[in-house]
């Protein structure tokens, strides 16, 4: 997290806000609900209280405007700048302005007013942008899904550094951003994508370029807004410029940023039995056109060319790949080796000699 220079903050805990005008995109009650919920994000974790005024001067004046709207920080039409807010202080201090050339919504369409407002009110209270891609105060808008919003830990640490904790946090689970060099790090899925490596963990993925050591961290939804926050397995089919992503009983085919029509499909359409609830890992072999799908202690082999499951499967993981354990969290193939991830460990397995040649920490893939 980051606070503003000179640690700008309010010297009182009871703050007022006023909605000066409304967007035509939403009903008045939807707008009021979004702002109320956005303030609650911050009051839940601090001693701050927010009271709405219907007229007069409030600490935080909220308005919608377009282009030049009276503060010499003009908006720019659709997309680009969405909103801005001033840090704590007199006059403009604390005020939040929303660009009415955007389409504001209470859903995933357009820009979600609650999410943008919660971010802006962070500025109104003294938080600057965070470098943590998982933080609400990260400067890039990402719709995080319909489920109950949980303020990320980085934002909690930031706001509590200014105002301290509240009496009781009604939602004490604050998601942490994974640390790539945590020795206990386990991974959810790994796939190549157009020459890069994508390494998934929780609602994030690291993107690793072959010529770089520093992996860049992204929210999965910043790349693919329609995908679930977390995924179970992934593999690339390079000759078709597609990657396949699995979550629960569903899977998606993606071309770059775009989901192919007809997806998601059910994993049973691949020929998996109905009792298989999820795929834990998947890896594709371009030279044979085969894909290994792991679930529980079993492995299936799918023929991507003929779109059928190979006979003689499923088989036990321990029988086909002795020594790697009886489950696979994530897997990928490179230069004749399969890399199996099981908890905080990865096994380098030679396809040619059919044996484990190295055992390494899982996060050595991230150069830790």
């Amino acid at each position: 997290y980051n606070v503003f220079p000179r640690t700008l903050k309010w010297s009182k805990m009871n703050l007022t806000y006023r909605i000066v005008n409304y967007t035509p995109d939403m009903t008045h009650s939807e707008v009021e609900k979004a702002f109320k919920k956005a303030f609650k994000v911050w009051s839940d974790v601090t001693p701050l209280n927010f009271t709405r005024l219907h007229d007069g001067i409030a600490d935080i004046m909220i308005s919608f405007g377009i282009k030049e709207h009276g503060d010499f920080y003009p908006f720019d039409g659709p997309s680009g700048l969405l909103a801005h807010a001033f840090p704590p202080g007199p006059n403009y201090g604390g005020d939040a302005h929303f660009d009415d050339d955007e389409t504001w919504t209470s859903s995933s369409k357009g820009y979600n007013l609650f999410l943008v407002a919660a971010h802006e009110f962070g500025h109104s209270l003294g938080l600057d942008h965070s470098k943590d891609p998982g933080a609400l105060m990260f400067p890039i808008y990402t719709y995080t899904g319909k489920s109950h919003f949980m303020l990320p830990d980085d934002d909690v640490q930031g706001i509590q550094s200014l105002y301290g904790p509240g009496d009781e946090d009604p939602n004490p689970k604050h998601p942490k951003t994974p640390d790539k060099c945590d020795p206990s790090l386990s991974l959810d899925a790994i796939t190549s994508l157009r020459g890069e490596t994508m390494i998934f963990k929780d609602r994030f993925f690291w993107r690793l370029h072959p010529q770089q050591v520093d992996a860049e961290l992204f929210l999965t939804k910043s790349f693919w807004p329609e995908l679930p926050n977390r995924i179970d397995a992934a593999y690339e089919h390079p000759s078709h410029d597609l990657i396949f992503i699995f979550r629960g009983r569903k899977f998606w085919a993606l071309n770059g940023y775009d989901i192919l029509e007809g997806y998601p499909k059910k994993i049973s359409e691949l020929g998996l039995p109905k009792e298989v609830k999820k795929i834990s890992a998947a890896v594709h072999f371009e030279d044979t056109g085969k894909t290994l799908l792991f679930s529980g202690n079993q492995v299936w082999r799918y023929d991507d060319t003929n779109h059928i499951m190979d006979k003689d499967y499923p088989r036990l993981i321990e029988e086909d790949f002795p020594g790697i354990g009886d489950k696979v969290d994530a897997v990928y193939e490179k230069n004749g080796y399969i890399y199996f991830f099981n908890g905080p460990i990865q096994f380098e397995y030679s396809i040619w000699s059919n044996r484990i040649v190295r055992v390494m920490p899982a996060n050595s893939i991230l150069w830790c």
């Epitope: 659709p78 997309s79 890039i140 808008y141 990402t142 992204f218 910043s222 790349f223 807004p225 410029d241 071309n255 770059g256 940023y257 775009d258 192919l260 029509e261």
Partner: nanobody, 114 residues
Framework: EVQLVESGGGSVQTGGSLRLSCAAS????????MNWYRQAPGKQREFVAG???????NYAVSVKGRFTISRDNAEGTGYLQMNSLKPEDTAVYYC????????WGLGTQVTVSS
């Protein structure tokens, strides 16, 4: 319906630069990914660069650091700035909106000579 028209192709020496443009007609351009693909004679069409609706970029390993993709939703235009061009960059470059199942331009020829 989105129509795409590429421009900016041409001939250039090794190490030179070109800027390709992709003009889109149709109001849904801003809601689709914007990509550049290329096809060299006798080869398959290959991905070059892409930019999401949220302006997150993705490059083929062979062009990363040399090519820059950008978009202007208000103008309905996409761009590909190509620097340090190599003879192996010679191809017809196609603009795409929305991925493989989306919309395609007719292409613009880029020739890099040594």
């Amino acid at each position: 319906e989105v129509q795409l028209v590429e421009s900016g192709g041409g001939s250039v020496q090794t190490g030179g630069s070109l800027r390709l443009s992709c003009a889109a007609s149709g109001s849904t351009f801003s809601r689709r990914s914007m990509n550049w693909y290329r096809q060299a004679p006798g080869k398959q069409r290959e991905f070059v660069a892409g930019i999401s609706t949220g302006r997150i970029t993705n490059y083929a390993v062979s062009v990363k650091g040399r090519f820059t993709i950008s978009r202007d939703n208000a103008e309905g235009t996409g761009y590909l700035q190509m620097n340090s061009l190599k003879p192996e960059d010679t191809a017809v470059y196609y603009c795409n909106a929305g991925g493989l199942q989306g919309y395609w331009g007719l292409g613009t020829q880029v020739t890099v000579s040594s």
